[in-house]
Every structure is written in C-alpha cells, then in structure tokens.
Amino acid sequence: QGGTRSPRCDCAGDFHKKIGLFCCRGCPAGHYLKAPCTEPCGNSTCLVCPQDTFLAWENHHNSECARCQACDEQASQVALENCSAVADTRCGCKPGWFVECQVSQCVSSSPFYCQPCLDCGALHRHTRLLCSRRDTDCGTCLPGFYEHGDGCVSCPTSTLGSCPERCAAVCGWRQMF
C-alpha cells in the first residue's frame, strides 16, 4: 500500500476532480474556486470573478481568475468588446485601420498593431476590397484619371497638356501637334 496512486473520482457525470480531500464538481465560467467541496462529489464554493478578471471555461477548478488584457494603445489598438467575467477583452483596430500581424505565422492570439487603411479615393482609384483584415485593395483609376507610372494622373483640362496613348484611351482625345 505504499506506492503512488493517482486520485480516482467515482462520481456520476463528468467535471469532478480531486481537490483537497474530495472529488469536487468544477466551477461555472465567470467564477473561481474559493473553497473545495467538503463531501465526495460535492459542489465547490465558487465566487464571481472580481472586476477586470475573467474565466471563460465551464466546470474548471481554477482558484483565481485571469486578468483581463489591456489593449495596446502604442499599437493603436482599441477594445472591440470590453472584458466580462466570462470573456477577455477583444482588442482590434478602429474603423479605417487594419491589423498588421507582428509575426509571420499569424493566429488570433498573435501580437499585432493597427495601420491606417489606404484611402483609394485620395489615390484617385476605385476601392476593390474594403479594408478590414488587411489593407484596402485599390483598383483602376477613377473616371477622369489615367494610369501613369504608379499613380493616377488627372486627364488634361486643355489641349496644352500632353496626352500619351493611355491618356487618350481614357480621356478620349489625343493632343494634336
């Protein structure tokens, strides 16, 4: 009778774990374990997580709640959803900004910073894909503008300006020499 014995829980249903002397039922989400049960298969004493802390799991045996994360203002993050007893703060970017991951293999918990979205209008281009998870995808030049190098150039308003071939195709006329 001297060897190692792993604690067994002979309780109906799941969610029982040996805590202290007895197998106890876990606490609900948003609560922490204040005191273990004092009888087999009993209910633990569970208290609501204090402000600015949370526990998202059901039927757990944690004796303290996790601290809510603070959104990183330096990275231009904002709280999309405030922390509650059952869920952590959800940080993201404000409208007009997008998430730029700080690691190559990006997952939901990866560190990130917020970047301002490209304004396609300011670049005189159509918006092909709105900025959300990544930067705005701008399309072709707006009416009255033509492709020139990397940018969109306004169609000439007089015959004095030069109008190369691409200009003529878009702007509808060719300068006469």
């Epitope: 190692t4 202290g20 002397l21 004092t38 009888e39 087999p40």
Partner: antibody, heavy 119, light 113 residues
C-alpha cells in the same frame, strides 16, 4: 511497512502552545491526505485537523478552528500540528492518521502522543 | 455536523458467540453519485491505537479476518463478529468519512465472559 510515529506531547498550562510532529515512512508521503485525531480521557475519538496531498487544503472542526494549524513538510515526510490558546478540554492522546486516497477513512494510525493541559 | 450514535455502549459475550453492534448517523451516508456508504469501523485493543476494520460500510480492510462483517445503508449500520475470539476484546468505533468534520461514534466496549 507503513509507519507513523508521533512526538511532541507534553504538559502545558492553559493558554499555552505546543507543536506535535508525526514522522511518516514506508509510503509516498506526499501522495496522501493526513489527519490528526485525538482521544479524550473518556475514550472518545475526535477528528481535529486534516491536510490534503498536492496543492494543500486544510480542514478543521469548529472546536479548534483558529487555534490549531496543520501543516506538512513533504521533503521531511513529516506532518505537524501547531496548537495555541490551549484549553483543559484539549487534553488527549493525539494520533496522526493516513487517509485512504479514495474514501478518506483512516487506513493507518500512529501510536499517539499525549498532551495534558493543566494549571 | 453529522452525529454518530453507537449502541450498546458495552457488551459481554462468550467465545464463539455472534456479536452485533450498531451505529446510527444523523444524516444519510449514502452518496447518490456512486451508491457508496461512507462509514468505517475501527477496532482499538487495550493500550493500542485504532485499527481500520471496515470502510464503505461493508468493504473489509485487507488482513482483517472474515468473521468481521459490516452491513447497512443510509443511516443504520451494523458490525457483526460471526464467532467472537479472545483477541477481539476491544473498543469498536464507527466513523463517517462522508464529510468534514469527520465524526466518530462514542464506541462499543466488547468484553469476553
């Protein structure tokens, strides 16, 4: 062979303090809950404290809560009972007992150590 | 707290006789989750410490002679010695190991005639 050996019993004046020890051998001490049980001069058995294995939780009856403290040193395979504000009714033979891991009955007992509280 | 009441407080029996002692708890010791009764019986011989005989009301501890039989459920329990021997001269205590505070009966003293 499982062995529990208590020590530290003494004559103490009311209001005094004392610490009892229980040296354990023959089993993996840190895997088991342990208790102190006392036997009064009229032969009644009274459970006075328990301590769990692993993350330690402690348990006391109201009669000793706030006066007695159970603790364990797993490295030394030793159980302790620190008693303060002692009263004449604490006079008893004090046994340490090992909890069965499954049912919390006491599957092994030590030979006991005597505490006498008297002025 | 669960109160444990033992009866009789003492009894004197002849060798070979059948002995029955009782233990009553103030609340049920039957756990609905696992259908186990959390009651133990201990034997304490003169000048010795208590020794576990039976746990979960009817499970005999290893090494305990099979003349010791535990029975009962809920609040009423019995320890029977089917044929008493001279070495059975002792005090017998029941204990609920259901919940803290763990509590004991006041004991039954078995004397041999």
């Amino acid at each position: 062979e499982v062995q529990l050996v208590e020590s530290g019993g003494d004559f103490v004046k009311p209001g005094g303090s004392l610490k009892l020890s229980c040296a354990a051998s023959g089993f993996t001490f840190n895997n088991y809950g342990m208790s102190w049980v006392r036997q009064t001069p009229d032969k009644r058995l009274e459970w006075v404290a328990a301590i769990s294995s692993g993350v330690t939780y402690t348990y006391y009856p109201d009669t000793v809560k706030g006066r007695f403290t159970i603790s364990r040193d797993n490295a030394k395979n030793t159980l302790y009972l620190h008693m303060s504000s002692l009263k004449s009714e604490d006079t008893a033979m004090y046994y340490c007992g090992r909890h069965d891991d499954y049912g919390n009955h006491f599957d092994y007992w030590g030979q006991g150590t005597t505490l006498t509280v008297s002025s | 707290d669960i109160v444990m009441t033992q009866s009789p407080s003492s009894l004197a029996m002849s060798l070979g006789q059948r002995v029955t002692m009782n233990c009553k708890s103030s609340q049920s010791l039957l756990n609905s989750h696992n259908q186990k009764n959390y009651l133990a019986w201990y034997q304490q011989k003169p000048g010795q410490s208590p020794k576990l005989l039976v746990y979960f009301a009817s499970s005999r501890e290893s090494g305990v002679p099979d003349r010791f039989i535990g029975s009962g459920s809920g609040t009423d329990f019995t320890l029977t010695i089917s044929s008493v021997q001279a070495e059975d001269l002792a005090d017998y205590f029941c204990q609920q190991h259901y919940s803290t505070p763990f509590t004991f009966g006041s004991g039954t003293k078995l004397e041999i005639k």
